[in-house]
Each structure stands twice: as C-alpha cells, then as structure tokens.
C-alpha cells in the first residue's frame, strides 16, 4: 500500500527544504525565505522561529531546520528548546517574585539558577563536619566518628566498587 501510494503521490518525492506546491501541479518548490521543512513530502513549510528580545540566535534557520535560540547574558533557558528565558542570580541567591534574594542561613545555591537547598546534615549520614557551608556551597562532610577512634586504621581505604554511570577515579 505504501509503495502504491508513493507512486500515486508525487509529493512524496519532495525532499526536506521543499514543499509540494498544490498551486503548481504539485511540483516541489523551495521553501520561501524564513521558512523550512525538516522532512520530505511536506505540503507546507514551517515559519522559522525568530529569536528576539531576550532571546538570541544560537543557530540560524535554514531551509531544512528551524532556528535555535538561547538567552542573552544575564538570563538562562527554561523549557524544551529554550522556550523561556529566566533571569540569572548570583551564586548564593535564588530568584523570587521580588527578584534575586540571598539564600537563608543553612541553605546554599552553587549556581546562577535554581533554588537554595539545605546544607547537608553530616551527622544524618554518619559523618563529621570538615568545613562549614556557605551561601554559595554545601557543607563538606568529613570522616565518620568511628574512623577517628583510637585504633582506627589510617591507611587509605581501597577504592569502592565502581557504580554504574560513574567513571573510575
């Protein structure tokens, strides 16, 4: 059936970058400026995305692919295909409805985006605190108290078994 249809349908021969022009006896016409078709057999070309305002062009539109946008400096992409741009904050801050606000004590954000997260509670993980956290980074936990007791081995432990998705150290 597919083969029969393709023999009957001249539009199936139109490659990406063209469209099947019904106004011209279904011959393949190139996509007009500022439009594209990414697959063959299209009856229309799609309008190219325009990167305006806070968006800037990361990849120009071509006859076979849409333009790609990213965000101007001071903003970062959100959503599929960078559908939105959100204001950057400094490390140690998070974006609120009232703008960028410093992380509350006991929380940190080590990126220019996202929310402030609580410091790790080392004791919950059976660890001691090596260096306290700041607004910009998490606490660094140290060895477990058991490792510090008299008679504990000071020898470097063997490397743990490698977990899936982690390269060996």
């Amino acid at each position: 059936f597919e083969r029969t249809r393709s023999l009957q349908d001249p539009c199936s021969n139109c490659p990406a970058g063209t469209f099947c022009d019904n106004n011209r006896n279904q011959i393949c016409s190139p996509c007009p400026p500022n439009s594209f078709s990414s697959a063959g057999g299209q009856r229309t070309c799609d309008i190219c995305r325009q990167c305006k305002g806070v968006f800037r062009t990361r990849k120009e539109c071509s006859s076979t692919s849409n333009a790609e946008c990213d965000c101007t400096p001071g903003f970062h992409c959100l959503g599929a295909g960078c559908s939105m741009c959100e204001q950057d904050c400094k490390q140690g801050q998070e974006l609120t409805k009232k703008g960028c606000k410093d992380c509350c004590f006991g929380t940190f954000n080590d990126q220019k985006r996202g929310i402030c997260r609580p410091w790790t509670n080392c004791s919950l993980d059976g660890k001691s605190v090596l260096v306290n956290g700041t607004k910009e980074r998490d606490v660094v936990c140290g060895p477990s108290p058991a490792d510090l007791s008299p008679g504990a081995s000071s020898v470097t432990p063997p490397a743990p078994a490698r977990e899936p998705g982690h390269s060996p150290q």
Partner: nanobody, 125 residues
Framework: QVQLQESGGGLVQAGDSLRLSCAAS????????MGWYRQPPGKQRELVAA????????NYQDSVKGRFTISRDNAKNTMYLQMNSLKLEDTAVYYC??????????????????WGQGTQVTVSS
C-alpha cells in the same frame, strides 16, 4: 585513587614553629577539601584544620586558632600546616586527610575518604 604523603614532623621545643606538608598524587582533580587531623597517644583523632581546595575557605579547631595556619598550593597539589607557638598538648601524630565531593558525597556516588600514613610531632618542654 588519591595518595597522600605527609612530611615535616619532628621534635621541637614549646614555643617553636613547625611546618607540615601533605603532597597529593593520583586523581587529585577529584579532591574537594583537605584537612589535618591529629591523634594524641591513646586519644581520639581530632580535626585540627581543613581547607576547601577551590576557594580556600578554612575551618580551625578552637584550640589552634591564631597559632596554626592551613594553606594549599593547587598547582603543586600540596597542603600545608604552619604551626606556631607550639604547646605540649600539640604532641600527636598528624594525619593528612582528603575528601572528594561536597556534602556527604553520597548523592554523587562518591564515598571517598583518603588518609596519609601520619607524621609524628613531639613538643617538649
């Protein structure tokens, strides 16, 4: 793997100074923080000082504040402990320690603590 080698320990008199070094080798790129722990005879090992490798932020045990200074040279993968105005109670085996990852490391699949073999510091009167 990370290997740590301490040096600089010895016998000194009270009030003297000493500088310990800890040279790291191996996968040093993975080290987040390093520290000095000490273990007096028959006692628990205790944190003396620690430093974040990236920003140099430090943490000191109260009893050494103002006397000891921890520093690092990232280019040489070496950490130092400058110990001034040494006291009898500073006598201990001093261990170099290195940590990979922030927090407990558990979320990143890291659970790596590395220790040196220790260097003896003895302060006499």
């Amino acid at each position: 793997q990370v290997q740590l080698q301490e040096s600089g320990g010895g016998l000194v008199q009270a009030g003297d100074s000493l500088r310990l070094s800890c040279a790291a080798s191996g996968s040093t790129f993975s080290i987040t923080a390093m520290g000095w722990y000490r273990q007096p005879p028959g006692k628990q090992r205790e944190l003396v000082a620690a430093i974040i490798m990236s920003d140099g932020d430090t943490n000191y045990q109260d009893s050494v504040k103002g006397r000891f200074t921890i520093s690092r040279d990232n280019a040489k993968n070496t950490m130092y402990l400058q110990m001034n105005s040494l006291k009898l109670e500073d006598t201990a085996v001093y261990y170099c320690y290195a940590r990979t990852g922030y927090g407990s490391g558990r979320l990143m699949g890291h659970e790596y603590d590395y220790w040196g073999q220790g260097t003896q510091v003895t302060v006499s009167s």
